[in-house]
């Protein structure tokens, strides 16, 4: 019996087609992805093949103005239109709190939404009961397939799930559900979830009875043969893991942003054992036409976005200096504003020991593309912020050793004075440079804001300590020459859309007046 698994993950609000790098589509003839194009390909496969499942491994939420405006209603609407068979909850599905998940998505989705390792407690337990499930058994042709979901246990540190959801260890939570499915006579089981490729592989190895793992969170690109675009494969598709009980378990992921449609064919014997698996992600480029009815629907939903982008988010009573003459040479107040917003967006998990789990931000000055003039009645709009942060990136959470941070700050000024983009703006950090010294030895003082303290204060950076830092995904991926971050980071979790982080902060503060205050000397 042959099953075709079509899968997406980390789509992050890319409902419209995008450019090759998943930013805003400029030249339509070279654009990719989007739900209209995805629908064309899915329908083509559904017509050609008998047993097809369309699955999403989480993080549909967060990433473009679509999510900012529609807050998840767009996800439910278009996933329903594409007739997804199941979705796993990702960490970003909690970005607007549990209510922001329940109302727009859980109550509106016509497909099961899954996670076995999220347990509700207290008053939320009855409110959310039945709206998401640990597993679902789906009829596929004359057979049935069990889908069991999982979500990163780090979600409380990455999003806003509140205090009434407990995120258990994935493997511990999955095993009893898989055992139950097996005992219920379900002999073909897919683990669908959002914890990253390393955890996906562990699940394949450790959870008895899982036949296939369809993952997300780490934006992993797997491919067999010559890759069709810019993404470099992290391994073959499918990636085969030998389980502890000796089975060959295929593990797949389909990069991110709806650029690819994962396509995996699995052959099962009559006892539900995997005999063979093969496939590849399908690049959703312009050779695949956009479905006209879905495209028309997208255009209808688009209208509200255009109206939103000119509405006032808040006011500034000072000039927001985002000029390259400032932000690439010295502390600039636009950099301070953005870093403050980045930290504010990550305020969660205070306890007796920690006032917050992260206090530090770094931001490449070259990523700040425009100032905002306060003389336009002080008004700040989404449109203004899109000029400041035009690349459609995310502000991510990483864990780095102090020694790596020191290298990053040396890199920040290694060729100071040439208006290059690597000069770092900061938050929760005080740095002193001596530019008379030779490159690689210019950082003379580097103090960082404590987190394990009731009164935050600045302490000298410790080389062997592990720190959490918020930074643009561009830096996490080694951009602007920050190869040491990419090579030495100990953990990387993708965060929220950059413009959304700043716009939310400005809306919250209502009136802003960021200063230059001696963070960089």
């Amino acid at each position: 019996w042959e099953l075709t698994i079509l899968h997406t993950n980390d789509v992050h609000s890319r409902l419209e087609q995008t450019s090759e790098d998943s930013s805003k589509c400029v030249n339509a003839s070279r654009c990719m992805g989007g739900v209209a194009r995805l629908f064309t390909k899915v329908q083509q496969i559904r017509r050609a093949e008998p047993n097809v499942l369309l699955l999403d491994a989480g993080d549909q939420y967060q990433g473009t103005i679509w999510f900012t405006v529609y807050k998840g209603a767009e996800v439910a609407h278009f996933m329903n239109a594409l007739r997804y068979d199941a979705m796993a909850l990702g960490n970003h599905e909690f970005d607007n709190g549990v209510e922001g998940l329940i109302e727009p998505l859980l109550k509106e989705a016509k497909f099961p939404i899954l996670s076995a390792n999220i347990k509700a407690k207290g008053p939320l337990a009855s409110q959310i009961s039945g709206l998401y499930l640990p597993y679902k058994v789906l009829p596929v042709g004359d057979e049935v397939v069990g889908i069991v979901g999982y979500t990163s246990k780090e979600t409380p540190f990455l999003s806003n799930p509140g205090t009434n959801l407990v995120f258990e260890d994935e493997i511990t939570a999955l095993q009893p559900e898989v055992d139950k499915l097996k005992t219920l006579n379900v002999n073909k089981i897919i683990a669908l979830g959002h914890s990253g490729f390393e955890t996906d592989k562990l699940i394949a190895q450790k959870v008895r009875g899982v036949d296939v793992v369809v993952g997300g969170h780490s934006n992993t690109f797997l491919y067999t043969g010559n890759p069709p675009s810019k993404e470099v494969p992290a391994g073959k598709y499918p990636f085969i893991v030998t389980s502890d009980d000796g089975r060959k378990v295929p593990v797949v992921q389909a990069y991110a942003f709806g650029k690819y449609l994962g396509y995996l064919k699995i052959e099962f014997d009559e006892r539900g054992n995997v005999i063979s698996s093969h496939g590849n992600p399908i690049l959703l480029n312009s050779s695949i036409p956009e479905d006209p009815s879905i495209k028309a629907d997208i255009n209808k939903w688009r209208i509200k976005l255009d109206n939103y982008s000119t509405q006032e988010l808040g006011k500034t009573i000072v000039y927001l200096d985002g000029s390259s003459q400032s932000c690439r040479f010295r502390e600039c107040n636009m950099g301070n504003l953005i870093c403050d917003a980045m930290i504010n967006n990550n305020l969660r998990h205070a306890d007796e020991m920690f006032w917050n789990h992260v206090s530090m931000c770094i931001l490449n000055g070259g990523g700040i593309r425009s100032p905002i003039d306060e003389r336009n009645n002080g008004t700040i709009t989404w449109e203004n912020l899109a000029a400041v942060l035009p690349f459609g990136g995310t502000f991510d959470l990483v864990q780095l050793k102090g020694s790596t941070l020191k290298k990053a700050f040396e890199h920040s000024v290694h060729r100071y004075g040439q208006s290059t983009g690597e000069f770092l703006q900061v938050g929760g950090i005080h740095v002193v440079y001596d530019l008379s010294r030779k490159p690689g030895d210019r950082v003379v003082k580097l103090d960082v804001l404590c987190t394990k303290c009731r009164v935050p204060s600045y302490d000298p950076l410790k080389m062997d300590e592990i720190y959490k830092v918020i930074l643009p995904n561009f830096l996490a991926n080694g951009g602007d020459g920050f190869q040491m971050i990419k090579d030495e980071l100990l953990r990387h979790d993708s965060g929220d859309q950059d413009i959304n982080v700043v716009s939310t902060y400005i809306s919250k503060m209502k009136v802003i007046y960021p200063a230059v205050e001696g963070r960089i000397k």
């Epitope: 679902k136 058994v137 049935v144 005992t183 219920l184 006579n185 002999n187």
Partner: antibody
Framework: EVQLLESGGGVVQPGRSLRLSCAAS????????MHWVRQAPGKGLEWVAV????????YYADSVKGRFTISRDNSKNTLYLQMNSLRAEDTAVYYC?????????????WGQGTMVTVSS | DIQLTQSPSSVSASVGDRVTITCRAS??????LAWYQQKPGKAPKLLIY???SLQSGVPSRFSGSGSGTDFTLTISSLQPEDFATYYC?????????FGGGTKVEIK
């Protein structure tokens, strides 16, 4: 012929134990999850317990949890139900049933039943 | 636990009549419902599995329908041997549960 044959029923005092057996024939026993279902006199059907094909995973009705243990010996094609701390409300005809080969579980083969009476 | 409510609890009918029995689940169980027939002193017999699939050897006058929470067993033309008690059963989750039964009696 596909067949299930229960044995071991009888009259027993409250608080005592009893072990039921179910001998299977005519099919590959170790391919199937096996169940016990009971029926109190004049009442409806009540599912009691299940054991998976390998004998690893077991699930019980709340009414018997901690008192009854389901087990199987695939080499002998036999299913068991060890019943401890018996109560008057456990009085019923006990059926062993095959859970079918596919999902959803539907009991496609039943034994003829064995009567258990718990009485002082 | 998933509760199954059968109605009616009993029905009087004549040979040749069309008889409909309903089963309502306390939560969504997709199509994972079975129907059984039981005659006095006998073990139950499987009629329908997966809400609408007829078990082999069962006459085609028996049919099942429904999904989610509402299910129906229909006997299109009642025969003398059909007078019995009928049970629904869910297998969406453990514990497996049965409906309370519907007794079909001769009018």
């Amino acid at each position: 012929e596909v067949q299930l044959l229960e044995s071991g029923g009888g009259v027993v005092q409250p608080g005592r134990s009893l072990r039921l057996s179910c001998a299977a024939s005519g099919f590959t026993f170790n391919f199937y999850g096996m169940h016990w279902v009971r029926q109190a006199p004049g009442k409806g059907l009540e599912w009691v317990a299940v054991i998976n094909d390998e004998g690893i995973n077991k699930y019980y009705a709340d009414s018997v949890k901690g008192r009854f243990t389901i087990s199987r010996d695939n080499s002998k094609n036999t299913l068991y139900l060890q019943m401890n701390s018996l109560r008057a409300e456990d009085t019923a005809v006990y059926y062993c049933a095959r859970g079918g080969a596919r999902y959803p579980i539907a009991f496609d083969i039943w034994g003829q039943g064995t009567m258990v009476t718990v009485s002082s | 636990d998933i509760q199954l409510t059968q109605s009616p609890s009993s029905v009087s009918a004549s040979v040749g009549d069309r008889v409909t029995i309903t089963c309502r689940a306390s939560q969504d169980i997709s199509s994972w419902l079975a129907w059984y027939q039981q005659k006095p002193g006998k073990a139950p017999k499987l009629l329908i599995y997966a809400a609408s699939s007829l078990q082999s050897g069962v006459p085609s006058r028996f049919s099942g329908s429904g999904s989610g929470t509402d299910f129906t067993l229909t006997i299109s033309s009642l025969q003398p041997e059909d007078f019995a008690t009928y049970y629904c059963q869910q297998a969406n989750d453990f514990p497996i549960t049965f409906g309370g039964g519907t007794k079909v009696e001769i009018k």
